[in-house]
Interface confidence: medium
């Protein structure tokens, strides 16, 4: 019997210091460019190697960014969100939603043990 895939949604405050190449990630989404069906939120599409976000390590591709320096990212056009990040300053506080995939065992199997059975 196959296990089912569940998702665990968690939120985290991530403080980044802008580097030479900016914050070090790309975004997708916005009211004019929905990345997720029926969700106009802003999502991380790519973490740039050796950038500020990659060096910090907490931000992941696929994370949803809820706010920047306390400003809500709801109801934003994509370019407006880009501008908000560009003008966010040197020290940037991000409120981020992680969606973690959790692989559960078969129904009825809740104990620890050797996965080979």
């Amino acid at each position: 019997m196959n296990g089912r895939v569940d998702y665990l949604v968690t939120e985290e405050e991530i403080n980044l210091t802008r580097g030479p190449s900016g914050l070090g990630f790309n975004i997708v989404g916005g009211t004019d460019q929905q990345y997720v069906s029926n969700d106009s939120g802003i999502y991380v599409s790519r973490i740039k190697e050796n950038g500020a976000a990659a060096l910090d390590g907490r931000l992941q591709e696929g994370d949803k960014i809820l706010s920047v320096n306390g400003q809500d990212l709801k109801n934003l056009l994509h370019q407006d969100a880009v501008d908000l990040f560009r003008n966010a300053g040197y020290a940037v506080s991000l409120r981020v939603q992680h969606r973690l995939q959790v692989q559960n065992g078969p129904i009825g199997h809740r104990g620890e043990g050797d996965p080979s059975g």
Epitope: S40, L76, D80, D83, L84, N87
Partner: nanobody, 124 residues
Framework: QVQLVESGGGLVQAGGSLRLSCAVS??????MGWFRQAPGKEREFVAA????????VYADAVKGRVTISRDNAKNTVYLEMNSLKPEDTAVYYC????????????????????WGQGTQVTVS
């Protein structure tokens, strides 16, 4: 997509009051304005409010009788109109500035990129 929906218009007697509302979706951090167009006349500026809500501008014709405000949590802009006159009769339009987080409030139609369908105000 961007949508602006006005409501609150209607028929009112001279000296009366109305409160117009504009529900905004698809865009944020924009200066917002109210304009009006009377039959046979050009669309004209009435009032505008900054994206943060801390600054307002009014047309001379409505100063002291009209108040513009916004509730960013509800994505709604309001136009409170008092001491209405027959010459206030027009279709009132809500509009969003084309510029993101613009520093100064514009009164020119050309600065406003997004428009609602309008709500009719008739003062008898």
């Amino acid at each position: 997509q961007v949508q602006l929906v006005e409501s609150g218009g209607g028929l009112v007697q001279a000296g009366g009051s109305l409160r117009l509302s504009c529900a905004v979706s698809g865009v944020s951090f924009r200066n917002m304005g109210w304009f009006r167009q009377a039959p046979g006349k050009e669309r004209e500026f009435v009032a505008a409010i900054s994206w943060s809500g801390d600054s307002t501008v009014y047309a001379d014709a409505v100063k002291g009788r009209v108040t513009i405000s916004r509730d960013n949590a509800k994505n709604t802009v309001y136009l409170e109109m008092n001491s209405l006159k027959p010459e206030d009769t027009a279709v009132y339009y809500c509009a969003a500035d084309g510029r993101f987080r613009a520093g100064e409030i514009g009164t020119s139609l050309g600065l406003y990129r997004y428009w609602g369908q309008g709500t009719q105000v008739t003062v008898s």
